[in-house]
């Protein structure tokens, strides 16, 4: 159908709750596109009625809420006037229990966000909340350890928690939980987020951290177009390289005629404390000699690698 | 649609205190935080603090943190602002202020002003 | 508390031509969740403030589209693509990244 393939890392998710992911990728869609979601490679797009508990809106898919059975591969086709892209996005749901007395015990949140905190800092948690204007949110409420936060070293802030005066005690396990409209029926949303304290002002050293990749497998097809990022994070005054590896070359170097494979341009986002650096790899066309080779993103003295993997063949 | 009305026009001897209104109607009226803000005469806008209506919790910038009080009336949807100790400089307008909505922040609604001047 | 900056004081702009405010805070306010908590206002002479632009670059409700917001963490600019008579006002930018919020002092657009 000549779209082509781009292979976005998988989204895990919790039972019976709205989500939403928003299909777009700023080189393609900052154009005149249509966009047109479908699931599991069927021919028949994701509807468009808004009453439909699984509907597109606008370039948007809306899970309300979201079931134990939609897990799965779903794909967003982009089409521009002389471009087709498709985007495979692999949902995992989960059952989630909280702080169901039934159950016993706090809920185990290290699957979910991980936020941090600087002691002895005024900082703030973020609840992280990606629905389309259809969709009206609040209040939002935070929890502590299965309690309501209250105090003067508290305030909630739109989707944020300020924390005046961060101490050790306020490591732990919160959930953000807000309220979301849409069509006149209510859902509740809830976002655990696992808290940890640094006393280091940003981030210390000068070692970098690779965020992504995490020395993985990423199942593609033969003869798609991939893109990768290798996020890292790092000081603001570091001095060190960020770059893609392959058999300890350059991945420019090693595809030095054909091109195929390549390093995109570096680009990073300044925060208070620390940069954000974005690098990736773009593998034009997949091919077999591309699997089980493992690609890597260096950073400074970090490393973390990609290994491309077949898909297993479906049989059903 | 969102409505803030506000208390008339207040004239005050140095010293004394003025308490200004703020009426809300046409949302949830303790889902919001309320911000006052003033405006000294041909001056910029300052931030006084905040008022969580449902818990009445006030956030205050600092400045202001010995005279002022916050309290609302949730059966008429009203807060409240008393500022006490007033001397010449806190001539100004008093604006309060609701968010966009609950999850962006900026004020997009506001009320439309009360004129307080101390003057002996 | 985080000072916002503001230039220039006042600017003078023929109706039709491109208009540029810009605002500069004292400390970062992209937040590590990808937002950057920085506003724009219009004070219209005798009335209160209007939300022009919020997080940094959306379009308030009802806001035309000749305004336009950027920036980086720390410098911000709005941008009036035409000028019209209505848009005359002193132009404030804020910041509500943390506790006390504050504003810039302002800058007066008038209309050659």
């Known amino acids: 159908d000549g779209c082509k393939d781009i292979f976005m890392k998988n989204e895990i998710l919790s039972a019976s709750q709205p989500f939403a992911f928003n299909c777009t990728f700023p080189p393609i869609t900052s154009g005149e596109v249509s966009v047109t979601w479908y699931k599991n490679s069927s021919k028949i797009p994701v509807s468009k009625i808004i009453q439909s508990r699984i509907h597109q809106d606008e370039t948007w898919i809306l899970f309300l809420p979201m079931e134990w059975g939609d897990s799965g591969v779903y794909q967003c086709v982009i089409k521009g006037r002389d471009s087709c892209h498709r985007i495979h996005v692999n949902l995992t749901v989960f059952e989630k229990h909280w702080c169901d007395t039934s159950i016993g015990g706090l809920p185990n949140l290290s699957d979910e966000y991980k936020q941090i905190l600087h002691l002895g800092k005024d900082d703030s948690l973020t609840c992280h909340l990606h629905f389309p204007k259809s969709c009206v949110l609040g209040p939002i409420k935070w929890y502590k350890d299965c309690n309501e936060i209250k105090g003067e070293r508290f305030t909630v802030l739109e989707t944020r928690l300020l924390v005046s005066n961060v101490s050790a005690e306020d490591r732990g396990n919160y959930a953000c939980q807000a309220i979301l409209t849409h069509s006149g029926k209510q859902y509740e949303v809830l976002n655990g987020i696992t808290v940890s304290i640094t006393e280091r002002a940003g981030y210390g050293g000068s070692v970098p951290k690779i965020i992504y990749p995490k020395n993985h497998s990423i199942e593609v097809q033969l003869g798609t177009t991939l893109i990768v990022d290798c996020n890292v994070t790092d000081t603001k005054d570091n001095t060190n390289l960020r770059c893609w590896r392959v058999n300890n070359t350059l991945v420019d170097d090693y595809y030095d005629e054909s091109k195929r494979i390549r390093e995109g341009v570096e680009t990073h986002v300044s925060f208070r404390e620390h940069n954000l650096y974005t690098v990736n790899i773009t593998f034009l066309e997949v091919k077999m000699e591309d699997y089980g080779l493992p690609f890597m993103c260096h950073a400074g003295v970090s490393t973390a690698y990609i290994i491309l993997q077949l898909p297993a063949p479906d049989f059903r | 649609q969102v409505q803030l009305v506000q208390s008339g026009a207040e004239v005050k001897k140095p010293g004394a205190s003025v308490k200004v209104s703020c009426k809300a109607s046409?949302?949830?009226?303790?889902?919001?935080?309320m911000n006052w803000v003033r405006q000294a005469p041909r001056q910029g806008l300052e931030w006084m603090g905040m008022?969580?209506?449902?818990?009445?919790?006030?956030r205050l910038n600092q400045k202001f943190k010995d005279r002022v009080t916050m309290t609302r009336d949730t059966s008429t949807s009203t807060v409240y602002m008393e500022l006490s100790s007033l001397r010449s400089e806190d001539t100004a307008v008093y604006y309060c202020?609701?968010?966009?909505?609950?999850?962006?922040?900026?004020?997009?609604?506001w009320g439309q002003g009360t004129l307080v001047t101390v003057s002996s | 508390d985080i000072v916002m900056t503001q230039t220039p004081l006042s600017l003078s702009v023929t109706p039709g031509q491109p208009a540029s405010i810009s605002c500069r805070s004292s400390?970062?306010?992209?937040?590590?969740?990808?937002?950057?908590?920085f506003y724009w206002y219009l004070q219209k002479p005798g009335q209160p403030p209007q939300l022009l632009i919020y997080?940094?670059?959306n379009l308030a409700s009802g806001v035309p589209d000749r305004f336009s917001g950027s920036g980086s963490g720390t410098d911000f600019t709005l941008k009036i693509s035409r000028v019209e008579a209505e848009d005359v006002g002193v132009y404030y930018c804020?910041?509500?990244?943390?506790?006390?919020?504050?504003f810039g002092g302002g800058t007066k657009v008038e209309i050659k």
């Open positions: 202020a609701r968010t966009t909505s609950m999850i962006i922040g900026g004020f997009a609604y």
């Open positions: 046409g949302y949830t009226f303790t889902n919001y935080w």
């Open positions: 008022f969580e209506p449902s818990n009445a919790v006030t």
């Open positions: 400390k970062s306010l992209l937040h590590s969740n990808a937002i950057t908590y």
């Open positions: 997080q940094m670059s």
């Open positions: 804020a910041q509500n990244l943390e506790l006390p919020l504050t």
